[in-house]
């Protein structure tokens, strides 16, 4: 007789999930040297620990301490890009621009991007049908907790300037309800952190309006001011220049600063 | 030295169809947005056209909207504009122009011109 | 879009003296703007953007001023190789629009 089995409004486990996972760790800790001494195979046991036989809306942060002590990770506080809807060109960015992380070009972040996973309450089973979906069916679900794990400690990590890339076209440009908006801006450190730069992208060329005078960005700077950091705005117009005098900085049509 | 060579101009009929090109050496085409600009005998000088660094957004103005194209081809340093469904108000010499275009700045304007080329249409 | 109308329509200037173009805005460019120099049967030449910055190689003669909508490019002292036509430019506002043009001829 087949189990009745949990249906949720998310999409179930990413196909493969404990392959991605271990591969990834196997993948990273090769191109990073100071990585090396990562067990891969105690990281998934770990990752795995978090989630399976619980019930995937009773997730804690708890649940994820053991896999967070594993993927401890320095990198430099000052070199910080967070990102919010607009992932894509964040990391586009950090690949050129090696020097800078966002949160997936750290271990753990790199693990799990673009992933979903969940488990079912006692029963060592990973649920490929279905997951949690965060509004629908519950936010303490497996994939919402580990990000708001990991986002708030590297969030935590920053220091100095921290850059922030946030998404021109949408209607929201600052949205509380994003991770950045409800994690990552409440756990920079002020005694740490100098500076939130947030580069407003625009998407396109037909859009003239300076964007860091929108009302969301001013709210952005009022909850950033009350916490003694200081702000400051730029609009990127055109982000495939950016890119590319990142790429070329030396060029002479790159004269603008970064 | 920055050089723009336009060719592909001449005579043709209403309705009929060009494809300009535009040469560029001198510099990293690339690293430029390219436009161009048409001037009809004895008259002004009238924007047409604009395509991004990489080809993926064009750029029309209303007159010509959706009967030119215009495109790029980065590996050849070259700068295209296919036109069809001509009319005799689109003759014109027609350059080719640079646009050094600022990632962190709107607008732009044209920092070099080609010698033009000629596109009439007359039955 | 936004239209740019130039005055005068032909200036007629000595060599030597100084001549004075206009260009107006429908509505605020900022600093905007761009000044081009066309002789006959030649492509136009950039001489001004940014309203006042001279363009690389262009004599001092040439001056730009101006923001907003009202806007003016200043020729010092005329050479024989200054009598040309001047179209400005506005590049604020999408789609970039010129002006008709000034032409300066000789007294």
């Known amino acids: 007789v087949p189990r009745w089995r949990q249906q949720w409004s998310g999409p179930g486990t990413t196909k493969r999930f404990p392959e991605t996972v271990l591969a990834r760790c196997v993948k990273y800790t090769e191109i990073h040297p100071e990585m090396r001494h990562v067990d891969c195979q105690s990281v998934w046991d770990a990752f795995k620990g978090a989630f399976i036989s619980k019930h995937p809306c009773n997730i804690t942060e708890e649940d994820y301490q053991p896999l967070m002590k594993l993927g401890t990770q320095t990198v430099p506080c000052n070199k910080i890009l967070l990102w919010s809807r607009i992932k894509d060109l964040a990391h586009q960015f950090t690949q050129v621009q090696r020097d800078m992380f966002t949160l997936e070009d750290t271990l753990l972040g790199y693990l799990a991007d673009d992933l979903t996973w969940c488990g079912e309450f006692n029963t060592s089973k990973i649920n490929y049908q279905s997951c949690p979906d965060w509004r629908k069916d519950c936010s303490n679900n497996p994939v919402s907790v580990f990000w708001k794990t990991v986002s708030r400690r590297f969030a935590e990590a920053a220091c100095d300037v921290v850059h922030v890339m946030l998404n021109g076209s949408r209607s929201k440009i600052f949205d509380k309800n994003s991770t950045f908006g409800s994690v990552e801006v409440h756990n920079l450190q002020p005694e740490k952190v100098q500076t939130l730069e947030a580069w407003v992208i625009h998407g396109g060329r037909e859009d003239s309006r300076d964007l860091c005078q929108d009302p969301t960005i001013k709210e952005l700077e009022s909850i950033i001011s009350k916490r003694n950091i200081q702000f400051s705005c730029k609009n990127i117009y055109r982000p495939d220049k950016f890119l590319q005098c990142v790429k070329n900085p030396e060029d002479s049509s790159c004269t603008s600063e970064i | 030295e920055v050089q723009l060579l336009e060719s592909g101009g001449g005579l043709v009929q209403p309705g009929g169809s060009l494809r300009l090109s535009c040469a560029a050496s001198g510099f990293t085409f690339s690293f430029y947005d390219m436009s161009w600009v048409r001037q009809a005998p004895g008259k002004g000088l009238e924007w047409v056209s604009a395509v991004s660094l990489y080809g993926d957004e064009t750029y029309y103005a209303d007159s010509v909207k959706g009967r030119f194209t215009i495109s790029r081809d980065n590996s050849k340093n070259t700068l295209y504009l296919q036109m069809n469904s001509l009319r005799a108000e689109d003759t014109a010499v027609y350059y080719c122009?640079?646009?050094?275009?600022?990632?962190?700045?709107?607008?732009?304007?044209?920092?070099?011109w080609g010698q033009g080329t000629l596109v009439t249409v007359s039955s | 879009e936004i239209v740019m109308t130039q005055s005068p329509a032909t200036l007629s200037v000595s060599p030597g003296e100084r001549a004075t173009l206009s260009c107006r805005a429908s509505?605020?460019?900022?600093?905007?703007l761009a000044w081009y120099q066309q002789k006959p049967g030649q492509a136009p030449r950039l001489l001004i953007y940014g309203a006042s910055t001279r363009a690389t190689g262009i004599p001092a003669r040439f001056s730009g001023s101006g923001s907003g909508t009202e806007f003016t490019l200043t020729i010092s002292s005329l050479q024989s190789e200054d009598f040309a036509v001047y179209y400005c430019?506005?590049?604020?506002?999408?789609?970039?629009?010129f002006g008709q043009g000034t032409k300066v001829e000789i007294k």
């Open positions: 430019q506005q590049y604020n506002n999408w789609p970039w629009t």
């Open positions: 509505q605020s460019v900022s600093s905007n």
């Open positions: 122009a640079r646009e050094p275009v600022s990632y962190d700045y709107y607008g732009s304007y044209f920092d070099y």
